[in-house]
Amino acid sequence: KSSNEATNITPKHNMKAFLDELKAENIKKFLYNFTQIPHLAGTEQNFQLAKQIQSQWKEFGLDSVELAHYDVLLSYPNKTHPNYISIINEDGNEIFNTSLFEPPPPGYENVSDIVPPFSAFSPQGMPEGDLVYVNYARTEDFFKLERDMKINCSGKIVIARYGKVFRGNKVKNAQLAGAKGVILYSDPADYFAPGVKSYPDGWNLPGGGVQRGNILNLNGAGDPLTPGYPANEYAYRRGIAEAVGLPSIPVHPIGYYDAQKLLEKMGGSAPPDSSWRGSLKVPYNVGPGFTGNFSTQKVKMHIHSTNEVTRIYNVIGTLRGAVEPDRYVILGGHRDSWVFGGIDPQSGAAVVHEIVRSFGTLKKEGWRPRRTILFASWDAEEFGLLGSTEWAEENSRLLQERGVAYINADSSIEGNYTLRVDCTPLMYSLVHNLTKELKSPDEGFEGKSLYESWTKKSPSPEFSGMPRISKLGSGNDFEVFFQRLGIASGRARYTKNWETNKFSGYPLYHSVYETYELVEKFYDPMFKYHLTVAQVRGGMVFELANSIVLPFDCRDYAVVLRKYADKIYSISMKHPQEMKTYSVSFDSLFSAVKNFTEIASKFSERLQDFDKSNPIVLRMMNDQLMFLERAFIDPLGLPDRPFYRHVIYAPSSHNKYAGESFPGIYDALFDIESKVDPSKAWGEVKRQIYVAAFTVQAAAETLSEVA
């Protein structure tokens, strides 16, 4: 049977019926419901929300909804022994202390169990010493400090501003530089947009607001104690000393009022250039230590957080496919929040809820998708993508054989300017075609398509008349599906104007002020952007689950492979002498990309012409499309990152949030001029070119005619 025989809705109305059922007012109600109390991972409140979602998804009409629990390592502040930072004088007296918690937002004064700001998984410790300001604590910032300015961070406490890169990378860089503690702070230059009031009068960060977040360097491992395997009842757990990715030095976040007090006394070297200056009225001196009058004063950290194995709960809902029930399209987003989760994650969870309700409504009317759709409400994303990763580890054999696509559904908005999409090249055409059919919610684009407003506001840097679509990085729950398992993945949300707003993320990210009111008053009062995101995410899931031929275009992969090969070649060509000396050639990679391009083109021609009424041939062609992403997986993984196995894409080694292309070659080339053994270093470059060329060629061959 085709999927259309399994339904009483005519084919051309399937997608329309689904989209028409999505309602902004419902998303608004769901968001309100999900944000009235904190839902921190591992807490009773988040378990109760899991059960509520399970119950509601059942009511909406899913075939089954189960809780999947795991016992993973989480981190919490000590309730009776709060974390803080102080300035101490020569007698050891604390003359200044940072805030113990954020002032509560209006209407939430009596809410209990608001976790105070902390850096999850920080070890305990009370280091004291001189302060060094390290800008964003990026790799290049430490290069500037150590190589150009000859400033040694060893034995120092470093203070870094949030933004630009994932906070875990900042901590890793500080550790490698020998620091004994890290203070993270939000500078108004990055978290206070000019001309906008601070919360509760606008969407800017108040001086007492603080960004929470984990500081792990898991590299895709999931639960730090059970890398590679699910943290189930019979799991073997590593000792804490062998745990994956834990920081070794105390770390704590603060707001800009407190940062001002630490930074205003800084002495030592002046900032190297204007890019090191934020917006506080301080000199942004690098240090080390305080100026003359205050030179005997030191900074002391007081960190008492604990790591605890704690139960978490995913909610997994199933809508069985009518024709190919053994092919899975997954829509997943997390449920756990740092506090109220007004944007992260509940603006996403509310959209997923409404998508489930719409699919359920169609199902109750007799329709079923062609393929099975799995819906997931992940737990413990904020603690290192733990819920999604443990579930994928538990179900890896099923997923690698049956996984068609994964669509992520974290925050629906990070602004209200235009659409932002990151996805596999296989989904480019799907996203283009879908957005051409959707109405733009943007002012000034009434009656125009979403594709048109998106392209106008966020044009592709390479192709005129097309919108920008970015590479997948990490920092969200698609990681295990894409980077480890090779399942085609994508994500979509509404974003800010990156041209005019250069602050990092959105100002109230991971603070107590991320409330329902923040969204309802300032970001999306009509919930029209949420609705658009629901249509994009839901529409992608619908097409992936229901189209007879999978909506993947392998030719788009060919185009980006050529672009990535050109890019990595040009990076390598910055060292022409060494390439000559060590006989480094990219011929094999360019040859493989050429072969991929030709084979993909021929496959696409066959895809147009084959007999779609022949279920065996249809399944065969769809399997070739489904397994193409899988073909880019190297079972051995990337060097020192065994769970990042995708050869074309990986999270940047310098910023987990960003995607890097040909990451094996890129990392081998990075800072190669400073390597002590150039012969060995260039040997590794050659090995990585070999791996990449082989993988591209092998992937191409999966698209060849089978016999």
């Epitope: 003359i95 200044f96 202390n97 940072t98 805030s99 113990l100 918690f101 954020e102 002032p103 509560p104 209006p106 004064e109 009031k197 601070s198 919360y199 509760p200 009068d201 108040p206 001086g207 007492g208 009022y257």
Partner: antibody
Framework: QVQLVQSGAEVKKPGASVKVSCKAS????????MHWVRQAPGQGLEWMGY????????RYAQKFQGRVTMTRDTSTSTVYMELSSLRSEDTAVYYC????????????WGQGTTVTVSS | DIQMTQSPSSLSASVGDRVTITCRAS??????LAWYQQKPGKAPKLLIH???SLESGVPSRFSGSGSGTEFTLTISSLQPDDFATYYC?????????FGQGTKVEIK
């Protein structure tokens, strides 16, 4: 320089209303909250509520809910505090004071307005 | 509402003395405590906010410390101009509340 200038002393009968004004100068009027604090003779300070000229939001202490109204006139950068159904225990000096934001302490104060409620 | 309790309610001291006033909150207010000085017939004047941040123009002999529920205002060397009533106030949660005041008199 920042100045908050309040209206003059008032004598009112029980049951009447009083409207005290606070004229701001030397800063951007809409950028700061305006609070009202009162002090009964020989007593301590008591916070009554705030008015936010940026968005006209108000917040009143529970004790004054229903009796106090705070308004503004942007053209003259003036905030008004009206207290109705006056009783003798409302006899006090009423101060306006500004704060930078919702969470910030009151950095500049008016000179105070004495309100006497007496039959 | 958060209750603020000041002690002592009054104290006598001489010029040059070190004076300490304490303020206790009925629940943790982090560091969001302000100290005001008021002289007879005058409006209060902000000395310290956020527990220890000295308002500009306030002499450095005034200092604030504390966190959570216990706070102190210290005048390191009392000057003739410092004889006044001092109030603490929490500015973390509405309704804002004040301590009952501490009157510093000449011995």
């Amino acid at each position: 320089q920042v100045q908050l200038v309040q209206s003059g002393a008032e004598v009112k009968k029980p049951g009447a209303s009083v409207k005290v004004s606070c004229k701001a100068s030397g800063y951007t009027f809409t950028d700061y909250y305006m609070h009202w604090v009162r002090q009964a003779p020989g007593q301590g300070l008591e916070w009554m509520g705030y008015f936010n000229p940026y968005n006209d939001y108000t917040r009143y202490a529970q004790k004054f809910q229903g009796r106090v109204t705070m308004t503004r006139d942007t053209s003259t950068s003036t905030v008004y505090m009206e207290l109705s159904s006056l009783r003798s225990e409302d006899t006090a000096v009423y101060y306006c004071a500004r704060s930078d934001g919702y969470y910030d302490a009151m950095d500049y104060w008016g000179q105070g307005t004495t309100v006497t409620v007496s039959s | 509402d958060i209750q603020m309790t000041q002690s002592p309610s009054s104290l006598s001291a001489s010029v040059g003395d070190r004076v300490t006033i304490t303020c206790r909150a009925s629940k943790s207010i982090s560091k969001y405590l302000a100290w005001y000085q008021q002289k007879p017939g005058k409006a209060p004047k902000l000395l310290i906010h956020s527990g220890s941040s000295l308002e500009s123009g306030v002499p450095s002999r005034f200092s604030g410390s504390g966190s959570g529920t216990e706070f102190t205002l210290t005048i390191s060397s009392l000057q003739p101009d410092d004889f006044a009533t001092y109030y603490c106030q929490q500015h973390i949660e509405y309704p804002w509340t004040f301590g009952q005041g501490t009157k510093v008199e000449i011995k």
